[in-house]
């Protein structure tokens, strides 16, 4: 699951990792875009096991995983649904 | 060579416990995931645990969630698997396996296997 | 969770003949399945990754393919050592196994 969320919150990531993580492992990934007090767009993946990690949105492996999740829901919805949530 | 050594299956009684061990040899333990898989009597393969690398992430199917809990030791090579509370559905021949995922382009799954060691719960 | 059916459950063949089996996942996985033979006695062994990705070894006689929720592996000009059963792998959502085929010759 894709979730972009636009919060007023600063910025949650405290430490990015770009350490590859499987699809099978992953919950949903949750996009805060720039802005609103943060400076920079983070990526939150959520993992099966409840854990949470920041993960560096110039990562390869992520930016590809966004990509083809980008395309899947844009194949499935006629138009994207963005999530305007303050978690 | 990539070398797997299952041990410490054997006989339990149902509510009992049990610590298996895997070996491993042939290749660089700690830069690589793994897994335990088991094999019912019935020749079904089940998913047991996995672990990341350094140790930090497991994951667990549900229904061995809370009772078994996978571990390894990077500095001795070995993987292990503590089971407890167990019932008769446990029994089984239980494998570990390599879990190579090295990044989105190099994603096997469970790439070498063990020859397994069995466990039998009954009273 | 994801379910995968694998069919048949055996199957009989003779030499140098060829047999299909497959997988179906219970949704969408992406691609991501795995193919073992597992001989009594040893561990599973991996032949195909990714689908179709052959793994170093493995001869061209085993292949694979699918995408979506329907999945197939062959094994073309079959001999005596392909008896094994063979199972199928679901890792796009942690991990899923098929029941198993058990190839017997004729």
């Known amino acids: 699951v894709l979730e972009v969320y636009y919060t007023s919150l600063r910025c949650r990531c405290v430490q990015e990792s770009s350490v590859f993580i499987p699809r099978r492992f992953i919950d949903r990934i949750q996009i805060l875009p720039r802005g609103n007090g943060c400076p920079r767009k983070e990526i939150i993946v959520w993992k099966k096991n409840k854990s949470i990690v920041c993960v560096d949105p110039q990562a390869e492996w992520i930016q590809r995983m966004m990509e083809v999740l980008r395309k899947r829901s844009s194949s499935t919805l006629p138009v994207p649904v963005f999530k305007r949530k303050i978690p | 060579e990539v070398q797997l050594v299952e041990s410490g299956g054997g006989l339990v009684k149902p509510g009992g416990s049990l610590k298996l061990s895997c070996a491993a040899s042939g290749f660089t333990f700690s830069s690589y995931a793994m897994s335990w898989v088991r094999q019912t009597p019935e020749k079904r393969l089940e998913w047991v645990a996995t672990i990341s690398d350094g140790g930090s992430d497991t994951y667990y199917p549900d229904n061995v969630k809370g009772r078994f809990t996978i571990s390894r030791d990077n500095a001795k090579n070995n993987l292990y698997l503590q089971m407890s509370h167990l019932k008769s559905e446990d029994t089984a021949m239980y494998y570990c396996?390599?879990?190579?995922?090295?990044?989105?382009?190099?994603?096997?799954?469970?790439?070498?296997w063990g020859q397994g060691t069995s466990v039998t719960v009954s009273s | 969770d994801i379910q995968m059916t694998q069919s048949p459950s055996s199957l009989s063949a003779s030499l140098g003949g060829k047999v299909t089996i497959t997988c179906k996942a219970s949704?969408?996985?992406?691609?991501?399945i795995t193919w073992y033979q597992h001989k009594p006695g040893k561990g599973p062994r991996l032949l195909i990754h990714y689908t179709s990705t052959l793994q170093p070894g493995i001869p061209s006689r085993f292949s694979g393919s699918g995408s979506g929720r329907d999945y197939s592996f062959s094994i073309s000009n079959l001999e005596p050592e392909d008896i094994a059963t063979y199972y199928c792998l679901q890792y796009d959502n942690l991990y899923t196994f098929g029941g198993g085929t058990k190839l017997e010759i004729k």
């Open positions: 396996a390599r879990d190579y995922y090295g990044s989105s382009y190099e994603d096997y799954a469970m790439d070498y």
């Open positions: 949704q969408d996985i992406n691609k991501y």
